[in-house]
Interface confidence: low
């Protein structure tokens, strides 16, 4: 009967922000500036991540955790830990895999992002089209035809355009 | 770290004001994203009244508090406002500040621990 | 304004429970929908983002799904400090809305 021995690895002392230094008889040194840990036992700090270009830092790196990027204003974020970052759209388009598509007909989007979304049926609620529907505006529907007395104007100016996310005041 | 800290709340008489302020540090207000006020009224859910954009050009409101609530930032001191006048019963709340992290859309990814307004007689 | 229907509004559940909470929006918000925990007397805490991105730091056991209308937060094995309240928030439009929330009881 063989006993088998547990062997205690020394590396797995160090905590997190440190690193197993070989050159230093196995001793936890801090990592590095710019360098990171994010767990214990490690023999190297990884690198931090930097956030230029289109590229923005969400959160800064520490000696326990990698940088954060996030994409400047006019660009989203696409990928796992947004490791890409893609243009946004324009009103009157949406995106798609391939890219930012133009509304199909009978759709709009007022946004610089989400869905292109039908024209709202003014004949469902018995009314008429006052102002007809674009690629980035919603129809305006009025009174219904026999409604209409000669000479008499209701059209109602279409709804301000929206940035991504919001409805300015 | 980020990290927002609200201040100013208190008890105040209805048709009153209060001034919140959050106070950032870790982050500059000034980097972008939008910075927020949300509320919870006592064992309820939460409800968002207003944001304003990095450069501090465009502000939104919720309807229940537009015209009465005015939000604002100073960038020398990093700290965002929250100007509350009119106030009624039902704007008693805890009121949080956050930031909106911007991937693909807007979440609010920090806050603030929250500062308690009584709207009471 | 787009509203945002949780079910269920509360529910008891045991350690090591798969729990599933959903999330309807009354409009199409694409993938625009975040959500948060809450415990008493903490500000929320952010989970998951654009629908199925875990936050940093946020254990995997936590996942979300769905687009459109209709959304999933999914809690594999819950954990005794899982124990909170959540909710769903869309950021398609303004103004921004929250689900009325959804508290997670021990049974």
């Known amino acids: 009967f063989e006993r088998t021995r547990s062997l205690q690895d020394p590396c797995s002392n160090c905590p997190a922000g440190t690193f197993c230094d070989n050159n230093r008889n196995q001793i936890c040194s801090p990592c590095p500036p710019n360098s990171f840990s994010s767990a214990g036992g490690q023999r190297t700090c990884d690198i931090c991540r930097q956030c230029k270009g289109v590229f923005r830092t969400r959160k800064e790196c520490s000696s326990t955790s990698n940088a954060e990027c996030d994409c400047t204003p006019g660009f989203h974020c696409l990928g796992a830990g947004c490791s890409m970052c893609e243009q946004d759209c324009k009103q009157g388009q949406e995106l798609t895999k391939k890219g930012c598509k133009d509304c199909c007909f009978g759709t709009f989007n007022d946004q610089k992002r989400g869905i292109c979304r039908p024209w709202t049926n003014c004949s469902l609620d018995g009314k008429s089209v006052l102002v007809n529907g674009t690629k980035e505006r919603d129809v305006v529907c009025g009174p219904s035809p026999a409604d209409l007395s000669p000479g008499a104007s209701s059209v109602t100016p279409p709804a301000p355009a929206r940035e991504p996310g919001h409805s300015p005041q | 770290e980020v990290q927002l800290v609200e201040s100013g709340g208190g008890l105040v008489q209805p048709g009153g004001s209060l001034r919140l302020s959050c106070a950032a540090s870790?982050?500059?207000?000034?980097?972008?994203?939008?910075w927020d006020w949300i509320r919870q009224a006592p064992g309820k859910g939460l409800e968002w009244v207003s944001s304003?954009?990095?450069?501090?050009?465009?502000?939104y409101y919720a309807d229940s508090v537009k015209g009465r609530f005015t939000i604002s930032r100073d960038n020398s001191k990093n700290t965002l406002y929250l100007q509350l006048n009119s106030l009624r019963a039902e704007d008693t709340a805890v009121y949080y500040c956050?930031?909106?992290?911007?991937?693909?859309?807007?979440?609010?990814?920090?806050w603030g621990q929250g500062t308690l307004v009584t709207v009471s007689s | 304004d787009i509203q945002l229907t949780q079910s269920p509004s509360s529910l008891s559940a045991s350690v090591g429970d798969r729990v599933t909470i959903t999330c309807r929006a009354s409009?199409?918000?694409?993938?625009?929908l975040a959500w948060y925990q809450q415990k008493p007397g903490k500000a929320p805490k952010l989970l998951i983002y654009?629908?199925?991105s875990l936050e940093s730091g946020v254990p995997s056991r936590f996942s979300g799904s769905g687009s459109g209308t209709d959304f999933t937060l999914t809690i594999s094995s819950l954990q005794p400090e899982d124990f909170a309240t959540y909710y769903c928030?869309?950021?398609?439009?303004?103004?921004?809305?929250f689900g009325q929330g959804t508290k997670v009881e021990i049974k």
């Open positions: 654009d629908a199925s």
């Open positions: 928030q869309q950021y398609y439009s303004t103004p921004l809305t």
């Open positions: 304003i954009s990095g450069d501090g050009d465009t502000t």
């Open positions: 409009q199409g918000i694409s993938s625009y």
């Open positions: 870790g982050y500059s207000i000034s980097s972008g994203y939008y």
């Open positions: 956050a930031r909106e992290y911007y991937g693909y859309g807007y979440a609010l990814d920090y």
